[in-house]
Protein backbone atom coordinates (compact mmCIF):
# COMPACT_ATOMS: atom_id res chain seq x y z
CA UNK A 1 0.00 0.00 0.00
CA UNK A 2 1.42 3.33 -0.99
CA UNK A 3 0.49 7.01 -0.80
CA UNK A 4 0.38 9.09 -3.96
CA UNK A 5 0.37 12.83 -4.50
CA UNK A 6 -2.70 14.32 -6.20
CA UNK A 7 -2.84 17.94 -7.34
CA UNK A 8 -5.93 19.97 -8.16
CA UNK A 9 -6.67 23.72 -8.33
CA UNK A 10 -7.63 25.46 -5.12
CA UNK A 11 -10.57 27.43 -6.53
CA UNK A 12 -12.84 27.19 -9.57
CA UNK A 13 -15.84 29.35 -10.44
CA UNK A 14 -18.68 27.56 -12.17
CA UNK A 15 -20.06 29.08 -15.36
CA UNK A 16 -23.45 30.75 -15.50
CA UNK A 17 -24.75 27.48 -16.90
CA UNK A 18 -23.66 25.61 -13.78
CA UNK A 19 -20.63 23.91 -15.30
CA UNK A 20 -17.28 23.64 -13.54
CA UNK A 21 -14.11 22.09 -14.94
CA UNK A 22 -10.79 21.34 -13.32
CA UNK A 23 -7.74 19.12 -13.78
CA UNK A 24 -6.84 16.39 -11.34
CA UNK A 25 -3.21 15.33 -11.72
CA UNK A 26 -1.59 12.42 -9.92
CA UNK A 27 2.06 11.50 -9.58
CA UNK A 28 1.89 7.86 -10.65
CA UNK A 29 4.76 5.94 -9.05
CA UNK A 30 4.20 2.89 -11.23
CA UNK A 31 2.70 1.85 -14.54
CA UNK A 32 -0.94 1.44 -13.64
CA UNK A 33 -3.30 -0.09 -16.17
CA UNK A 34 -6.53 0.39 -14.18
CA UNK A 35 -7.28 3.69 -12.47
CA UNK A 36 -10.31 4.73 -10.44
CA UNK A 37 -11.15 8.40 -10.03
CA UNK A 38 -13.75 9.56 -7.52
CA UNK A 39 -15.00 13.10 -6.96
CA UNK A 40 -16.21 13.76 -3.43
CA UNK A 41 -17.95 16.82 -2.06
CA UNK A 42 -17.34 18.05 1.45
CA UNK A 43 -19.79 20.51 2.94
CA UNK A 44 -19.59 21.10 6.67
CA UNK A 45 -18.70 17.65 8.05
CA UNK A 46 -20.65 15.72 5.42
CA UNK A 47 -18.76 13.88 2.67
CA UNK A 48 -20.73 12.63 -0.31
CA UNK A 49 -19.75 10.98 -3.58
CA UNK A 50 -20.40 13.13 -6.63
CA UNK A 51 -19.22 10.70 -9.29
CA UNK A 52 -16.70 7.98 -9.96
CA UNK A 53 -15.10 6.34 -12.97
CA UNK A 54 -12.80 3.40 -13.50
CA UNK A 55 -10.78 3.37 -16.68
CA UNK A 56 -8.00 1.49 -18.37
CA UNK A 57 -4.98 3.61 -19.21
CA UNK A 58 -5.19 4.78 -22.81
CA UNK A 59 -8.94 4.30 -22.93
CA UNK A 60 -11.74 6.83 -22.64
CA UNK A 61 -12.80 7.88 -19.16
CA UNK A 62 -16.40 6.75 -18.67
CA UNK A 63 -18.53 7.92 -15.76
CA UNK A 64 -21.38 5.55 -15.07
CA UNK A 65 -24.32 5.65 -12.67
CA UNK A 66 -26.19 8.53 -14.41
CA UNK A 67 -23.31 10.79 -13.59
CA UNK A 68 -23.28 14.58 -13.62
CA UNK A 69 -19.59 14.30 -14.42
CA UNK A 70 -17.73 13.88 -17.66
CA UNK A 71 -14.03 13.66 -18.18
CA UNK A 72 -11.06 12.80 -20.31
CA UNK A 73 -7.70 11.35 -19.36
CA UNK A 74 -4.29 12.10 -20.71
CA UNK A 75 -1.34 10.39 -19.09
CA UNK A 76 -1.49 11.15 -15.39
CA UNK A 77 -4.03 13.94 -15.82
CA UNK A 78 -7.78 13.70 -15.61
CA UNK A 79 -9.83 16.61 -16.95
CA UNK A 80 -13.07 16.66 -14.97
CA UNK A 81 -16.28 18.54 -15.73
CA UNK A 82 -19.22 18.69 -13.35
CA UNK A 83 -22.55 19.84 -14.78
CA UNK A 84 -25.89 20.93 -13.42
CA UNK A 85 -24.44 22.83 -10.48
CA UNK A 86 -26.51 25.32 -8.49
CA UNK A 87 -25.61 27.75 -5.74
CA UNK A 88 -26.46 25.17 -3.10
CA UNK A 89 -23.77 22.88 -4.59
CA UNK A 90 -20.99 25.30 -3.65
CA UNK A 91 -18.41 23.36 -1.67
CA UNK A 92 -15.07 21.62 -1.58
CA UNK A 93 -14.70 18.98 -4.30
CA UNK A 94 -12.01 16.42 -3.58
CA UNK A 95 -10.32 14.35 -6.27
CA UNK A 96 -9.47 10.83 -5.12
CA UNK A 97 -7.32 8.62 -7.35
CA UNK A 98 -6.73 4.90 -6.87
CA UNK A 99 -4.31 2.83 -8.91
CA UNK A 100 -6.23 -0.44 -8.85
CA UNK A 101 -4.08 -2.68 -11.02
CA UNK A 102 -1.47 -4.07 -11.14
CA UNK A 103 -0.38 -4.25 -7.49
CA UNK A 104 0.69 -2.51 -5.39
CA UNK A 105 -2.41 -0.44 -4.74
CA UNK A 106 -1.86 3.31 -4.53
CA UNK A 107 -4.25 5.88 -3.06
CA UNK A 108 -4.03 9.61 -3.51
CA UNK A 109 -6.35 12.32 -2.26
CA UNK A 110 -6.18 15.93 -3.39
CA UNK A 111 -6.60 18.90 -1.10
CA UNK A 112 -9.83 19.77 -2.82
CA UNK A 113 -11.10 22.40 -5.24
CA UNK A 114 -13.48 24.97 -3.82
CA UNK A 115 -16.17 25.34 -6.47
CA UNK A 116 -18.27 28.47 -6.24
CA UNK A 117 -21.62 28.40 -7.97
CA UNK A 118 -23.74 31.50 -8.43
CA UNK A 119 -27.28 31.06 -9.68
CA UNK A 120 -27.92 33.38 -12.65
CA UNK A 121 -30.26 36.31 -12.09
CA UNK A 122 -33.61 35.74 -13.78
CA UNK A 123 -34.20 37.91 -16.81
CA UNK A 124 -36.45 40.88 -15.97
CA UNK A 125 -39.90 40.70 -17.48
CA UNK A 126 -40.34 42.79 -20.56
CA UNK A 127 -43.27 45.22 -20.89
CA UNK A 128 -43.67 44.58 -24.60
Amino acid sequence: CKAMHVAQPAVVLASSRGIASFVCEYASPGKATEVRVTVLRQADSQVTEVCAATYMMGNELTFLDDSICTGTSSGNQVNLTIQGLRAMDTGLYICKVELMYPPPYYLGIGNGTQIYVIDPEPCPDSDF
Epitope: T38, T48, D65, I94, E98, L107, I109
Partner: antibody
Amino acid sequence: EVQLVESGGGLVQPGGSLRLSCAASGFTFSSYTMSWVRQAPGKGLEWVATISRGGGYTSYPDSVKGRFTISRDNSKNTLYLQMNSLRAEDTAVYYCAREDYGSSYVHWFAYWGQGTLVTVS
Amino acid sequence: DIQMTQSPSFLSASVGDRVTITCRAGENIYSYLAWYQQKPGKAPKLLIYNARTLAEGVPSRFSGSGSGTEFTLTISSLQPEDFATYYCQHHYGSPRTFGGGTKLEIK
Protein backbone atom coordinates in the same frame (compact mmCIF):
# COMPACT_ATOMS: atom_id res chain seq x y z
CA GLU B 1 -34.00 5.35 10.66
CA VAL B 2 -31.73 3.30 8.39
CA GLN B 3 -33.03 -0.23 7.95
CA LEU B 4 -31.53 -3.11 5.98
CA VAL B 5 -33.41 -6.41 5.87
CA GLU B 6 -31.85 -9.45 4.21
CA SER B 7 -33.77 -12.44 2.88
CA GLY B 8 -33.32 -15.43 0.60
CA GLY B 9 -31.01 -17.54 2.72
CA GLY B 10 -31.54 -21.25 3.22
CA LEU B 11 -30.16 -24.72 2.65
CA VAL B 12 -28.63 -25.49 -0.74
CA GLN B 13 -26.57 -28.34 -2.14
CA PRO B 14 -22.94 -27.89 -3.23
CA GLY B 15 -22.87 -26.59 -6.78
CA GLY B 16 -26.28 -25.01 -6.36
CA SER B 17 -27.39 -21.40 -6.62
CA LEU B 18 -29.14 -18.91 -4.36
CA ARG B 19 -30.12 -15.25 -4.64
CA LEU B 20 -30.08 -13.05 -1.57
CA SER B 21 -32.01 -9.79 -1.32
CA CYS B 22 -31.60 -6.80 0.95
CA ALA B 23 -34.49 -4.35 1.28
CA ALA B 24 -33.35 -0.88 2.26
CA SER B 25 -35.39 1.90 3.85
CA GLY B 26 -34.92 5.11 5.83
CA PHE B 27 -32.42 6.67 3.42
CA THR B 28 -31.95 7.51 -0.26
CA PHE B 29 -30.77 4.11 -1.44
CA SER B 30 -29.46 5.31 -4.81
CA SER B 31 -27.02 7.69 -3.11
CA TYR B 32 -24.96 5.02 -1.39
CA THR B 33 -22.43 2.36 -2.24
CA MET B 34 -23.59 -1.01 -0.86
CA SER B 35 -21.78 -4.21 0.09
CA TRP B 36 -22.20 -7.78 1.28
CA VAL B 37 -20.14 -9.16 4.16
CA ARG B 38 -20.33 -12.72 5.44
CA GLN B 39 -19.50 -14.58 8.63
CA ALA B 40 -19.01 -18.35 8.78
CA PRO B 41 -20.39 -20.00 11.94
CA GLY B 42 -18.12 -19.19 14.88
CA LYS B 43 -15.67 -17.38 12.60
CA GLY B 44 -14.73 -13.83 11.69
CA LEU B 45 -16.01 -11.38 9.08
CA GLU B 46 -15.20 -11.48 5.36
CA TRP B 47 -16.04 -8.85 2.75
CA VAL B 48 -17.82 -10.45 -0.22
CA ALA B 49 -18.87 -7.79 -2.75
CA THR B 50 -19.36 -4.07 -3.32
CA ILE B 51 -21.46 -2.14 -5.84
CA SER B 52 -21.45 1.56 -6.67
CA ARG B 53 -24.48 3.83 -6.32
CA GLY B 54 -25.86 3.20 -9.79
CA GLY B 55 -24.47 -0.28 -10.25
CA GLY B 56 -21.82 0.67 -12.78
CA TYR B 57 -18.91 -0.57 -10.66
CA THR B 58 -18.58 -3.85 -8.77
CA SER B 59 -15.75 -5.43 -6.81
CA TYR B 60 -15.15 -8.90 -5.31
CA PRO B 61 -12.44 -10.77 -3.41
CA ASP B 62 -10.77 -13.69 -5.18
CA SER B 63 -12.67 -16.19 -3.00
CA VAL B 64 -15.99 -15.43 -4.76
CA LYS B 65 -14.95 -13.80 -8.03
CA GLY B 66 -16.64 -15.44 -11.00
CA ARG B 67 -19.19 -17.20 -8.81
CA PHE B 68 -21.01 -14.34 -7.04
CA THR B 69 -22.64 -11.32 -8.66
CA ILE B 70 -23.79 -8.24 -6.79
CA SER B 71 -26.52 -6.07 -8.30
CA ARG B 72 -29.09 -3.51 -7.27
CA ASP B 73 -32.46 -2.12 -8.28
CA ASN B 74 -32.64 1.48 -7.15
CA SER B 75 -36.29 1.75 -8.15
CA LYS B 76 -37.07 -1.01 -5.62
CA ASN B 77 -34.49 0.05 -3.01
CA THR B 78 -33.12 -3.47 -3.11
CA LEU B 79 -29.63 -4.98 -3.16
CA TYR B 80 -29.01 -8.51 -4.49
CA LEU B 81 -26.33 -11.18 -4.31
CA GLN B 82 -26.54 -13.98 -6.87
CA MET B 83 -24.48 -16.92 -5.65
CA ASN B 84 -23.62 -19.72 -8.08
CA SER B 85 -21.44 -22.83 -7.82
CA LEU B 86 -21.84 -22.77 -4.07
CA ARG B 87 -19.33 -24.60 -1.88
CA ALA B 88 -19.40 -25.83 1.71
CA GLU B 89 -17.03 -22.99 2.65
CA ASP B 90 -19.66 -20.46 1.53
CA THR B 91 -21.80 -21.46 4.53
CA ALA B 92 -22.22 -18.26 6.52
CA VAL B 93 -24.50 -15.50 7.68
CA TYR B 94 -24.60 -12.91 4.91
CA TYR B 95 -25.00 -9.27 5.89
CA CYS B 96 -25.73 -6.35 3.61
CA ALA B 97 -24.12 -3.10 4.61
CA ARG B 98 -24.39 0.56 3.64
CA GLU B 99 -21.12 2.33 3.10
CA ASP B 100 -20.52 5.90 4.21
CA TYR B 101 -17.59 8.19 3.61
CA GLY B 102 -15.63 9.32 6.63
CA SER B 103 -13.41 12.33 7.00
CA SER B 104 -10.61 10.41 5.27
CA TYR B 105 -12.69 10.12 2.06
CA VAL B 106 -12.70 6.33 2.27
CA HIS B 107 -15.75 4.10 2.75
CA TRP B 108 -16.72 2.45 6.03
CA PHE B 109 -19.43 -0.15 6.65
CA ALA B 110 -21.66 2.23 8.56
CA TYR B 111 -24.94 0.30 8.78
CA TRP B 112 -25.59 -3.44 8.72
CA GLY B 113 -28.64 -5.62 8.28
CA GLN B 114 -29.47 -8.47 10.67
CA GLY B 115 -28.14 -11.10 8.26
CA THR B 116 -29.48 -14.19 6.51
CA LEU B 117 -28.03 -17.68 6.94
CA VAL B 118 -26.84 -19.65 3.91
CA THR B 119 -26.03 -23.32 4.49
CA VAL B 120 -24.31 -25.31 1.75
CA SER B 121 -24.55 -29.00 2.56
CA ASP C 1 -4.05 -9.05 0.62
CA ILE C 2 -3.27 -7.09 3.76
CA GLN C 3 -3.20 -9.33 6.81
CA MET C 4 -4.88 -7.92 9.92
CA THR C 5 -3.84 -9.47 13.23
CA GLN C 6 -5.70 -8.80 16.46
CA SER C 7 -4.51 -9.52 19.97
CA PRO C 8 -5.50 -10.90 22.29
CA SER C 9 -8.06 -13.32 20.83
CA PHE C 10 -9.75 -13.59 24.21
CA LEU C 11 -9.83 -11.11 27.05
CA SER C 12 -11.42 -11.40 30.48
CA ALA C 13 -12.17 -8.22 32.37
CA SER C 14 -14.49 -6.75 34.97
CA VAL C 15 -16.98 -3.88 34.86
CA GLY C 16 -15.06 -0.64 35.39
CA ASP C 17 -11.79 -1.98 33.98
CA ARG C 18 -9.79 -0.21 31.32
CA VAL C 19 -9.08 -2.53 28.40
CA THR C 20 -6.98 -2.24 25.27
CA ILE C 21 -7.19 -4.32 22.11
CA THR C 22 -4.42 -4.23 19.53
CA CYS C 23 -4.64 -4.58 15.76
CA ARG C 24 -1.61 -4.93 13.52
CA ALA C 25 -1.64 -4.49 9.75
CA GLY C 26 0.69 -6.45 7.52
CA GLU C 27 1.72 -3.22 5.81
CA ASN C 28 1.20 0.50 6.10
CA ILE C 29 -2.50 1.40 6.00
CA TYR C 30 -2.01 4.96 7.27
CA SER C 31 -5.16 5.76 9.30
CA TYR C 32 -7.58 3.73 7.18
CA LEU C 33 -8.83 1.48 9.96
CA ALA C 34 -12.24 0.81 11.46
CA TRP C 35 -13.37 -0.97 14.63
CA TYR C 36 -16.64 -2.89 14.96
CA GLN C 37 -18.47 -4.39 17.92
CA GLN C 38 -20.54 -7.56 17.55
CA LYS C 39 -22.80 -9.14 20.12
CA PRO C 40 -23.92 -12.80 19.85
CA GLY C 41 -26.59 -13.29 17.19
CA LYS C 42 -26.42 -9.64 16.15
CA ALA C 43 -24.92 -7.70 13.26
CA PRO C 44 -21.63 -5.85 13.71
CA LYS C 45 -21.85 -2.20 14.70
CA LEU C 46 -19.40 0.48 13.57
CA LEU C 47 -17.55 2.03 16.53
CA ILE C 48 -14.61 3.91 15.08
CA TYR C 49 -13.41 4.83 11.59
CA ASN C 50 -10.31 6.57 10.34
CA ALA C 51 -8.48 4.95 13.29
CA ARG C 52 -9.73 7.48 15.84
CA THR C 53 -13.04 9.02 14.76
CA LEU C 54 -15.99 7.91 16.88
CA ALA C 55 -19.05 6.85 14.89
CA GLU C 56 -22.36 8.54 15.59
CA GLY C 57 -23.93 7.50 18.89
CA VAL C 58 -20.88 5.65 20.21
CA PRO C 59 -20.09 6.42 23.89
CA SER C 60 -16.97 8.45 24.59
CA ARG C 61 -15.48 5.66 26.73
CA PHE C 62 -14.43 4.10 23.40
CA SER C 63 -11.36 5.53 21.74
CA GLY C 64 -9.03 4.54 18.94
CA SER C 65 -5.43 5.41 18.21
CA GLY C 66 -2.53 4.49 15.99
CA SER C 67 -1.47 4.79 12.38
CA GLY C 68 0.68 2.91 9.93
CA THR C 69 0.65 -0.69 11.11
CA GLU C 70 -0.17 -0.49 14.84
CA PHE C 71 -3.62 0.40 16.16
CA THR C 72 -5.42 0.17 19.48
CA LEU C 73 -9.00 0.25 20.66
CA THR C 74 -9.40 1.35 24.27
CA ILE C 75 -12.46 1.16 26.50
CA SER C 76 -11.78 3.44 29.45
CA SER C 77 -14.30 1.97 31.87
CA LEU C 78 -16.05 -1.26 30.89
CA GLN C 79 -19.82 -1.31 31.09
CA PRO C 80 -21.93 -4.51 31.14
CA GLU C 81 -23.10 -3.87 27.56
CA ASP C 82 -19.50 -3.74 26.29
CA PHE C 83 -18.92 -7.48 26.60
CA ALA C 84 -18.84 -8.56 22.97
CA THR C 85 -16.47 -9.43 20.13
CA TYR C 86 -14.47 -6.62 18.54
CA TYR C 87 -13.09 -6.59 14.99
CA CYS C 88 -10.67 -4.27 13.25
CA GLN C 89 -10.77 -3.79 9.49
CA HIS C 90 -8.65 -1.89 7.02
CA HIS C 91 -10.29 0.21 4.33
CA TYR C 92 -7.23 0.81 2.22
CA GLY C 93 -7.57 -0.80 -1.16
CA SER C 94 -9.20 -4.11 -1.95
CA PRO C 95 -9.92 -6.61 -0.53
CA ARG C 96 -10.83 -4.93 2.74
CA THR C 97 -9.85 -7.52 5.31
CA PHE C 98 -10.87 -7.92 8.95
CA GLY C 99 -8.88 -9.00 11.96
CA GLY C 100 -9.73 -12.33 13.55
CA GLY C 101 -11.63 -10.71 16.40
CA THR C 102 -11.20 -10.23 20.14
CA LYS C 103 -13.80 -11.77 22.41
CA LEU C 104 -14.22 -9.69 25.56
CA GLU C 105 -15.68 -11.76 28.39
CA ILE C 106 -16.75 -11.03 31.95
CA LYS C 107 -14.17 -12.12 34.50
